[in-house]
Interface confidence: low
């Protein structure tokens, strides 16, 4: 199409293009439900799939729930975005123990510099505190870590990492040779500050890293801790649980260790839209009292599938469906998948809408 | 109960066109992603496209091998699918099965939980 | 375009043993803390059935003696005990990223 100045009636007859007076040009028209990424999309590939609030549209074209950052020691780095997730870091005064998708599974204090050491590099959202001797040069040789009244330059110091823990009281004392010592201490030995910022947005590679409560001496039993309203999943990742906040939703089974919170919809109400552990769409139940279906699943499988029952099967309870046949049409690039499912309120996909001509191009 | 059933299949010459048909019942069709998958005779499956709904814009994908030459379309008011096949080759020849997505939610997974019967196309001169 | 590679192409295994097959992936079909694996059943003159979603998810009807593992580019399916009307073709298809594939099959005898 011409680029400067068509007249308005340029792109007339094409029913896919409207004129924009003010880029005076004409540009493609986004079918229902898609929206442009510009002003003035040229091709099918301007137009994207919407996503629900809070959801943001991932890679892979998939409809993904943006992680929140409304645990206590977490503030957003960066908003819920069309195209990438907020993102949470830990708050001014911590950093970031055990890192999480888009977050922080756990935050400690940072570390304050003992006597006889300074502020080489102050702590980040990512990175504890880094002490130097406060007299340069004068590091005293160490046969074994036992015998260093103070660290050489550039080391971190087995300083008091605090952890943020509100999860487990259990936090505050730990077993140790038959007593108890303060658990920070533990921490301190149990947690290094990482040497390079951990990396916000992506899983932890370290696999160990805080035990449900500090190992008793002989014991294997300890996993990671993730912080509350987090659960670890089968990769081990520190994932946030869904929340049953919307009116429409009750909690039907907790946030646990290994396994999510569950919603469903509210008494009174059928879940039309299923989500992973949730509804995505809840809607009065019809008078004809269908009901709703909980897919049977290994109990060891993490996710419950919630499903409304086949619409079809009562044909007097079928909220939905304008009829009509849709054309063919076919997709100019074989581009990622789109995720949103058979859904009325969450779509649509980034692929090509429906084609004009039968040709595919 | 959920049924799918294919038609339209039989024999045809290479470069000639045929179209499948998959009438369904059992579930309300509008809101399903449908599928086109074939297999030629003792060879192993291989997905051809499928047909949004819809809520997404009626839009379709298709495997390289038959990109160009097939198209998916579906009449929701009938709860019926299309597979149009132009320009057939002998390898088109196989069993033709159409298959319901299953629309479990975010994210959306993409698998095959209903398939019809199937109905055979040989294409041959 | 990701290709499935099933192995082994058939295998024989005595009523009551554990069958596995396996189903690599020329690139990772895992995504946003989901792995886009599935698993079907086909048995001679029939259309294929579906046993496993999303790597390990078991469909609604599907005995429990089959399960999924696997994420990233290697998965795994298990049969245990094998019964006689497990005798099948099994199939692998992924829906990491367009266009889908399927693996090449295992057929899966019983002793």
């Known amino acids: 199409f011409p680029q400067d100045r068509p007249f308005e009636d340029t792109c007339h007859g094409n029913p896919s293009h409207y004129y924009d007076k003010a880029v005076r040009r004409c540009c493609y028209r986004c079918p229902m439900g898609l929206f442009p990424t510009q002003q003035c999309p040229q091709r099918p590939t301007d137009c994207r799939k919407q996503c629900e609030p809070d959801y943001y549209l991932d890679e892979a074209d998939r409809c993904t729930a943006c992680v929140t950052c409304s645990r206590d020691d977490l503030v957003e780095k960066t908003p819920c975005a069309w195209n990438s997730s907020r993102v949470c870091e830990c708050r001014p005064g911590m950093f970031c123990s055990t890192s999480a998708v888009n977050s922080c599974a756990r935050c400690f204090f940072h570390s304050v510099c003992p006597a006889g050491m300074i502020v080489k590099f102050p702590g980040t959202a990512q990175k504890n505190t880094v002490c130097e001797p406060a007299s340069p040069g004068v590091s005293p040789a160490c046969a074994s870590p036992e015998n260093c009244k103070e660290p050489s330059s550039g080391t971190i110091p087995q300083a008091k990492p605090t952890p943020v823990s509100p999860a487990t009281s259990s936090a505050s004392t730990m077993p140790v040779r038959g007593g108890t010592r303060l658990a920070q201490e533990a921490a301190s030995k149990l947690t290094r500050a990482p040497d390079s910022p951990s990396s916000v947005g992506r899983p932890s590679s370290d696999p160990g890293l805080s035990p449900t409560q500090p190992c008793p001496e002989g014991s294997g039993d300890c996993r990671k801790q993730c912080e509350p309203d987090y659960y670890l999943d089968e990769a081990g990742r520190c994932t946030a649980c869904v929340s049953c906040s919307r009116d429409d939703l009750v909690e039907k089974t907790p946030c646990a260790w290994n396994s999510s919170r569950t919603c469903e919809c509210r008494p009174g109400m059928i879940c039309a839209t299923s989500a992973t552990n949730s509804c995505a769409r809840c809607v009065p139940y019809p008078i004809c009292a269908a009901e709703t279906v909980t897919k049977p699943q290994d109990m060891a499988e993490k996710d419950t599938t919630f499903e409304a029952p086949p619409l079809g099967t009562q044909p007097d309870c079928n909220p939905t469906p304008e009829n009509g046949e849709a054309p063919a049409s076919t997709s100019p690039t074989q581009s990622l998948l789109v995720d949103s499912q058979a859904s009325k309120t969450l779509p649509i996909p980034t692929s090509a809408p429906v084609a004009l001509s039968s040709t595919g191009k | 109960e959920v049924k799918l059933v294919e038609s339209g299949g039989g024999l045809v010459q290479p470069g000639g066109s045929l179209r499948l048909s998959c009438a369904t019942s059992?579930?309300?069709?509008?809101?399903?992603?449908m599928n086109w998958v074939r297999q030629p005779p003792g060879k192993a499956l291989e997905w051809l496209g499928f047909?949004?709904?819809?809520?997404?814009?009626?839009?379709?994908e298709f495997s390289a091998s038959v990109m160009g030459r097939f198209t998916i379309s579906r009449d929701d008011s009938q709860s019926i699918l299309y597979l149009q096949m132009n320009t057939l080759r002998a390898e088109d020849s196989a069993t033709y099965y159409c298959?319901?997505?299953?629309?479990?939610?975010?994210?959306?997974?993409?698998?095959?939980?209903?398939w019809g019967q199937g109905t055979s196309v040989t294409v041959s001169s | 375009d990701i290709v499935l590679t099933q192995s082994p192409a058939s295998l024989a295994v005595s009523l009551g043993q554990r069958a596995t097959i396996s189903c690599r992936a020329s690139?990772?079909?895992?995504?946003?803390?989901?792995?886009?694996m599935h698993w079907y059943q086909q048995k001679a003159g029939q259309p294929p059935k579906l046993l496993i979603h999303?790597?390990?998810n078991l469909e609604s009807g599907v005995p429990a003696r089959f399960s999924g593992s696997g994420s990233g580019t290697d998965f795994t399916l298990n049969i245990h005990p094998v019964e006689e009307e497990d005798a099948s073709t099994y199939y692998c298809?992924?829906?990491?990223?367009?266009?889908?594939?399927f693996g090449s099959g295992t057929k899966l005898e019983i002793k």
């Open positions: 298959a319901r997505d299953p629309p479990y939610g975010n994210p959306h997974y993409y698998a095959m939980d209903y």
């Open positions: 059992g579930f309300t069709f509008s809101d399903y992603y």
């Open positions: 047909i949004r709904n819809k809520a997404n814009g009626y839009t379709t």
């Open positions: 690139k990772s079909v895992s995504a946003s803390g989901y792995n886009y």
């Open positions: 999303l790597a390990s």
């Open positions: 298809q992924h829906s990491g990223e367009l266009p889908f594939t």
